[in-house]
């Protein structure tokens, strides 16, 4: 679990892009908006994050959608399927 | 299984410079985003420079204007250029797409010392 943390000042994503590897694990919490993340899943993909950054993406996901992911979000989650637990899963209303 | 090789590290001091490659085993390149990394000891693993499936180019804050990276797709070739090297550059320096850094799957990487 990442430490709630303030973003620094400018460091507020405007985008998902990659200048988003760069940013340290609590960085990524504090700065990145999880709807913002939700609706440019699309592009999470195409970005070389490392396992330990995909893991506060995913969380990130968790905290928006405790209920389960969208489908909008479980079409495009890419990589980040790999982070996803049988539970994550169970949660899914898929049709 | 793709397999990442990278080169080019050593020992140099302060203000020289270096050049690393990175190869890899498949045409994993093209159409996908190359970064380089590095790991310092007892330290987290981070993103130095990562060029775009375009070629577009982004750097960490520690190294702009300094690092350069750059590809060369037909050769499945990545490159970076590390000049006015510091000590705290020193690390092992590692290339990845997000294939492989999704999956933690990792070179062996190349050491990059910087001393006098």
């Known amino acids: 679990e990442v430490e709630k943390t303030a973003c620094p000042s400018g460091k507020k994503a405007p985008e998902i892009d990659e200048s988003l590897i760069f940013y340290k694990k609590w960085e990524l919490e504090a700065c990145v908006d999880a709807a913002l993340l939700a609706t440019q899943m699309d592009r999470v993909n195409a970005i070389p994050f490392t396992y330990e950054q995909l893991d506060v993406l995913k969380h990130k996901l968790d905290e928006l959608y405790p209920q389960g992911y969208p489908e909008s979000v479980i079409q495009h989650l890419g990589y980040l399927f790999l982070k996803m637990s049988p539970e994550d899963i169970r949660k899914w209303n898929v049709t | 299984q793709v397999q990442l090789v990278e080169s080019g590290g050593g020992l140099v001091q302060p203000g020289g410079s270096l050049r690393l490659s990175c190869a890899a085993s498949?045409?994993?390149?093209?159409?996908?985003?190359v970064a380089w990394y590095r790991q310092a000891p007892g330290k987290e693993r981070e993103a130095v420079a990562v060029?775009?499936?375009?070629?577009?180019?982004k750097y960490a804050d520690s190294v702009k204007g300094r690092f350069t990276i750059s590809r060369y797709n037909a050769k499945n070739i990545a490159y970076l250029q590390m000049n006015s090297l510091k000590p705290e550059d020193t690390a092992v320096y590692y290339c990845?797409?997000?294939?492989?850094?999704?999956?933690?799957?990792w070179g062996q990487g190349t050491q990059v010392t910087v001393s006098s």
């Open positions: 498949g045409s994993i390149f093209s159409g996908n985003a």
């Open positions: 060029i775009t499936r375009d070629g577009d180019t």
């Open positions: 990845n797409t997000a294939r492989g850094a999704a999956v933690d799957s």
